[in-house]
């Protein structure tokens, strides 16, 4: 995307002792219009079962344009990916809502201690090509142990990271079957430069 | 996750030369300070018993100049709304903290099923002129059985959305009178434009 | 608010029909490249058991330069604080992990009364130095009655709040040793100027 | 199992060109970048580029621009590299290789001759 | 582009001795990466992001350094462990390859 606007250059006094520039330089500062930051807000589908593999969470994927979703100036969404044009540190955030149902967990004992609960975990995943292995950013992690109820509730996630042009970012969670994909109020998805 | 046979991942061709802008390009942009942007940061009040039409959650009223609530940069709050001044991409955000007493509630059947659960629900509206309806862009919903206790716990909900001139956000409660307004940091409401 | 750094003009090229200043027209404002605004994410370290006043929650430390944390552009981190250097509107946020074990809560009462539940609590609190009281910004606070088991869960809180130079934000909890340390994605605190 | 299986050796002309093919199995090629890399008989490593499969953007060496095109096909989980106007400095094995997701995997390696 | 210059080009080396190899970059990376390739075999990721064996990667190597200057040792050698290391760096485009330390026997 092109900008319609205006070449900035920025122009000040430096205080004295400042570190990057002599006084009275003029200096050029990466100044930009905050409408033309990469940004994306993507929200729930209903998920197709995928296979994946054995300890790794299976990846969400999302709408990107209907509703309230959309990505823009560069912020490209694909194959579950969110895809970052722009090096830069960026505000990224996540809601699943999951909903299931559990039997009464307190009565199944393991040798008299407590059991291992059943839980819900959601990780908002980095993939990139300066690092081997993904990195998880966040992760939101919840043991459910409802009383044999229907049981519903929501995780949500959000925090700043520096991120590199060509950083790929990803939903997964622990278990695909438990999303609520039924609002894009509920699930959903975003990052933007700051 | 392994794909389908035959499902491909979009795959697209980057202009020759790249993908974003050439370099040297002379940019126009509509720059403005930050510090003028519309920002409000709005906190909890008691609130005044309400009839409210059925099916349908009643508002939340707050507070906007006290202690740490404010409104700024021709962002207004009148009777439960925010006012959008200006179109563009704001954060907009909410945590309401519940409090209350839940009876055992696994021991309460239908025909043998598990119960439907009490549930404690929050969503953020936007409210256009130019539209019949309101728009849910935000909802956290979390079913309650706390086995015979006193409970309490919060919903936090953000996200990022482009709103135009003139909308109107609001906080929508499943239950006004479990809202704990005691303190103004447990229960708020905010946007800023990005 | 005062500027650190220098006053910034930016001349540009209004649109026609701009609404907010005529063609050519030369205007002052305070423009800033985004990438200079202090910043800071910091992630969970184990925390040494330091003794608190009571009625006074521990506050927690940070990493603020190892894996995913970072503070940049003049926010610093010293002794369980992120200094503020500038004044401004902030983001401020946190997501603290628990675990623990709880008996079986609803088992326990007094004179027939639900017992009070066992909790959870996280503040971001800001301390000015010009102010004697530190300042509660926001709270996450949960009743656990977990049915006997190995439970665990987040509190995730964020808000903006309009900060002034000088002053010091902390995380504080109810319960330093139910507080996940081990992993950076799980427990976190981070703050960047708008 | 995870692993890249490359196409078979390659004899061609200078002038000529070649496309090397390197087909993924265990993962999803959407999932990782796809690198090439290029060594020379007797000779060290040479990154030649990669591609992001999921968007279909590449990132060269500058001196492999020109002449060499990297590509995916994601329904056959195969990614290409395609070098152009051979010349005999071109003779050499090159790999496939993925990062973005461990374990790092490399293909076997492809030999390319050029001679006349 | 960030050069990466390896050192010593050869290191001679007995079985049951330590072995240290370098490599110095042009500019500062965040991680360094070792491969370890053997005559006819494609190169096997060896260290990653400075100091991460790979999996099947002995505890006898070791990887350590930052900013430019970056080291992998050997605590001691093992007949196997005769090959050729090369270190890449991932922090600058292009990526980039040292030439490689040949570690011989003795």
């Known amino acids: 995307q092109l900008r319609a606007q205006g070449e900035a250059c920025v122009q000040f006094q430096a205080l004295k002792g400042q570190e990057f520039a002599p006084s009275h330089q003029q200096v050029y500062a990466p100044l930009r219009a905050d409408g033309d930051k990469p940004r994306a807000h993507l929200t729930v589908v209903r998920q197709t079962p995928t296979q994946h593999f054995k300890n790794q969470f299976p990846a969400l994927h999302w709408e990107h344009e209907l509703g309230l979703a959309f990505t823009k100036n560069r912020m490209n969404y694909t194959n579950k990916f969110l895809l970052i044009p722009e090096s830069g540190d960026y505000f990224i955030y996540s809601q699943v809502t999951f909903r299931g149902m559990t039997s009464e967990c307190s009565e199944i004992r393991q040798a008299g201690r407590p059991n291992k609960p059943d839980s819900i975990t959601v990780v908002i995943t980095k993939v990139t090509d300066s690092y081997p292995e993904p990195t998880q950013l966040l992760m939101g992690t919840k043991s459910v142990c409802e009383v044999g109820s229907n049981w519903f509730q929501p995780i949500y996630l959000g925090a700043m990271f520096s991120l590199q042009e060509g950083d790929k970012l990803m939903v997964n969670v622990s278990d695909i079957s438990l999303v609520d994909y039924t609002k894009e109020d509920k699930t959903f998805f975003g990052a933007f430069l700051l | 996750q392994l794909r389908a046979q035959g499902e491909a991942c979009v795959q697209f061709q980057a202009l020759k030369g790249q993908e974003f802008a050439p370099s040297h390009q002379q940019v126009y942009a509509p720059l403005r300070a930050d510090g003028d942007k519309p920002r409000a940061h709005l906190t909890v009040v008691r609130q005044t018993p309400t009839q409210h039409f059925k099916n349908q959650f009643p508002a939340l009223h707050w507070e906007h100049e006290l202690g740490l609530a404010f409104t700024k940069n021709r962002m207004n709050y009148t009777n439960k709304f925010l006012l959008i001044p200006e179109s563009g991409d704001y954060f907009i955000y909410s945590q309401v903290t519940f409090r209350g007493m839940t009876s055992e509630c696994s021991e309460i059947r239908q025909a043998g099923r598990p119960n439907k659960p009490d549930s404690i629900t929050v969503v953020i509206t936007k409210v256009t002129d130019s539209y019949p309806e309101p728009t849910q862009l935000l909802m956290g919903t979390k079913s309650v059985c706390e086995v015979g206790s006193n409970w309490f716990q919060p919903i936090y909900l953000g996200a990022m959305f482009s709103l135009q001139e003139g909308d109107k956000l609001m906080v929508n409660v499943s239950d006004i009178s479990l809202v704990d307004y005691t303190k103004e940091d447990k229960t708020f409401f905010g946007a800023f434009l990005l | 608010q005062l500027r650190a750094q220098g006053e910034a003009c930016v001349q540009f090229q209004a649109l026609k029909g701009q609404e907010f200043a005529p063609s050519h027209q030369q205007v002052y404002a305070p423009l800033r490249a985004d990438g200079d605004k202090p910043r800071a994410h910091l992630t969970v370290v184990r925390q040494t058991p330091t003794q608190h006043f009571k009625n006074q929650f521990p506050a927690l430390h940070w990493e603020h330069e190892l894996g995913l944390a970072f503070t940049k552009n003049r926010m610093n981190y010293t002794n369980k604080f992120l200094l503020i250097p500038e004044s401004g509107d902030y983001f401020i946020y946190s997501q603290v992990t628990f675990r623990g074990m709880t008996s079986e809560c609803s088992e326990i009462r007094q004179a027939g009364r639900p017992n009070k539940p066992d909790s959870i609590t996280v503040v971001i609190t800001k301390v000015t130095d010009s102010y004697p009281e530190p300042t509660q910004l926001l709270m996450g606070t949960k009743s656990v009655c977990e049915v006997g088991s190995n439970w665990f869960q987040p509190i995730y809180l964020g808000a903006m709040f309009s900060l002034q130079e000088g002053d010091k934000l902390m995380v504080n909890v109810s319960d330093i040793s139910l507080v996940d340390y081990t992993k950076e994605d799980k427990t976190f605190f981070g703050a960047f100027l708008l | 199992q995870v692993q890249l299986v490359q196409s078979g050796a390659e004899v061609k002309k200078p002038g000529a060109s070649v496309k090397v093919s390197c087909k993924a199995s265990?993962?999803?090629?959407?999932?990782?970048?796809m690198h090439w890399v290029k060594q020379r008989p007797g000779q060290g490593l040479e990154w030649i580029g990669r591609?992001?499969?999921?968007?279909?953007?590449?990132k060269y060496d500058p001196k492999f621009q020109v002449r060499a095109t990297i590509t995916t096909d994601t329904s056959t989980s195969t990614a290409y590299l395609e070098l152009s106007s051979l010349r005999s400095e071109d003779t050499a094995v090159y790999y496939c290789a993925r990062s973005g997701g461990l374990p790092d995997v490399w293909g076997q390696g492809t030999t390319v001759t050029v001679s006349s | 582009e960030i050069v990466l210059t390896q050192s010593p080009g050869t290191l001679s080396a007995s079985p049951g001795e330590r072995a240290t190899m370098s490599c110095r970059a042009s500019?500062?990376?965040?991680?360094m990466y070792w491969y370890q390739q053997k005559p006819g075999q494609a190169p096997r990721p060896w260290i990653y992001a400075t100091s991460n064996l790979a999996s099947g990667v002995p505890d006898r190597f070791s990887g350590s350094g930052s900013g430019t200057d970056y080291t992998l040792t050997i605590s001691r050698v093992e007949p196997e462990d005769f090959a050729v290391y090369y270190c890449q760096q991932w922090s600058g485009n292009p990526r980039t390859f040292g030439g490689g330390t040949k570690l011989e026997i003795k």
């Open positions: 591609i992001d499969p999921a968007s279909g953007h590449t």
């Open positions: 265990g993962f999803d090629i959407c999932d990782t970048y």
């Open positions: 500019s500062s990376v965040s991680y």
